[in-house]
């Protein structure tokens, strides 16, 4: 019998509101034997997988998208799904990305730290749009090709 | 990479069909597969697609009509009682990477014919 | 249900020329939207997808662009090969716009 696989949860580094110019790193979090992360946004027909998954915890297991320059179009809300032979999960609850024009420039700290959204309540949307999608100039740290779209 | 369907052939209406999407050269499990149809002389016709994670969907006038379902490997699409009208070429197709609005991967289609 | 109004139905054009070609959808859909380029007895070949993005192997003379509902394609320095039944395509399959073809458009070149 197949497991019950857990809802994975997303979290962004350094924080969910990050001024114009400035590096995001969303996180997806699942248990361990990922083969695949993939990361989502809502009303975008664009998406991004990584198999750079790597051991979070002895119970977890995570992969890196970043961005390295943040512009207005990376606004929005982000959620992850993942693959664990032989099926995909439920998809992770939505995090909203909040992109902030500021005089303090790219290294300003000026983020709100820690936010996440975990395996809680299923997401309010229809959860069967199971792709409602991911990212202009997303990579997954270290191997993901940067994508562009107009 | 590639997909090619297959099962198309001569039947008669009420005579239940399935017709198989087979993928080569990628892993299946990342992808939408949609079928498609073309009426000789016709546009193409939009029937459904079985997602990357496991979902159906169906255009409204296909459902009750067929049934997609999907392997590691393969995806099928059942006609459940053809009429003549569904006499067409049946094609599968993939979309690319990184963007599930485009199919750039199609097979070369598959024939089926609805006929007494 | 989604509907896609694609626009004219047949359009002729000399070489060199340009060819507008529109599909109106009946509703929001973002960027889930391609369009298709099909000879006889040939598959569908994708030319744009996410609304504006030129597929791969595709020539900057196909255009893409998005307004609101109005999605248009335009070929321009219309070339012989380009003879062919185009479509518009929206294919989110996850319920929140839906799918389907527009009707097709045949471009002529004379």
């Known amino acids: 019998q197949e497991e019950d696989l857990p809802r994975p949860s997303i979290s962004a580094e350094p924080g969910t509101v990050i001024p114009l110019g400035s590096h995001v790193t969303f996180v997806c979090r699942g248990p361990v034997g990922v083969q695949t992360f993939r990361l989502e946004r809502e009303s975008r027909s664009t998406y991004n997988d990584t198999e750079d998954v790597s051991q979070a915890s002895p119970s977890e297991s995570e992969a890196r998208f970043r961005i390295d320059s943040v512009s207005e179009g990376n606004a929005g809300p982000y959620r992850c799904i993942y693959y664990k032979p032989p099926k995909w999960s439920e998809q992770s609850d939505y995090l909203e990305l909040l992109v902030k024009e500021t005089s303090g420039g790219p290294d300003s700290p000026d983020t709100e730290p820690g936010s996440s959204a975990g395996p809680t309540q299923r997401p309010s949307d229809n959860s069967h749009n199971e792709h409602a999608p991911a990212s202009q100039g997303l990579k997954a740290e270290h191997l993901y090709h940067h994508h562009h779209h107009h | 990479a590639a997909v090619k369907e297959s099962g198309g052939r001569l039947v008669t209406p009420g005579t239940p069909l399935t017709l198989t999407c087979t993928a080569s050269?990628?892993?299946?499990?990342?992808?939408?597969i949609q079928w498609v149809r073309q009426a000789p002389g016709k546009g193409l016709e939009y029937i459904g697609a079985?997602?990357?994670?496991?979902y159906t969907y169906y255009a409204s006038w296909a459902k009750g009509r067929v049934t997609i379902s999907r392997t590691s490997t393969t995806v099928d699409l059942k006609m459940t009682s053809p009429t003549t009208e569904d006499t067409a070429t049946y094609f599968c197709?993939?979309?690319?990477?990184?963007?599930?609005?485009?199919?750039?991967?199609w097979g070369p289609g598959t024939l089926v014919t609805v006929s007494s | 249900e989604l509907v896609l109004t694609q626009t004219p139905a047949s359009v002729s054009a000399a070489v060199g020329g340009t060819v507008t070609i529109k599909c109106q959808a009946s509703?929001?859909?973002?960027?889930?939207f391609a369009w298709y380029q099909q000879k006889p007895g040939q598959s569908p070949k994708l030319l744009i997808y996410?609304?504006?993005n030129l597929a791969s192997g595709v020539s900057s003379r196909f255009k893409g662009i998005r307004s609101g509902t109005e999605y248009t394609l335009t070929i321009s320095d219309l070339e012989c090969a380009d003879a062919a039944t185009y479509y518009c395509?929206?294919?989110?399959?996850?319920?929140?716009?839906?799918?389907?073809f527009g009707g097709g458009t045949e471009v002529e070149i004379n």
């Open positions: 050269g990628f892993s299946l499990y990342k992808y939408n």
């Open positions: 079985s997602t990357y994670a496991g």
């Open positions: 509703q929001s859909i973002g960027t889930w």
């Open positions: 395509q929206c294919s989110d399959v996850g319920n929140t716009y839906g799918a389907a």
């Open positions: 996410g609304a504006s």
């Open positions: 197709a993939r979309h690319i990477d990184g963007d599930y609005s485009g199919y750039a991967l």
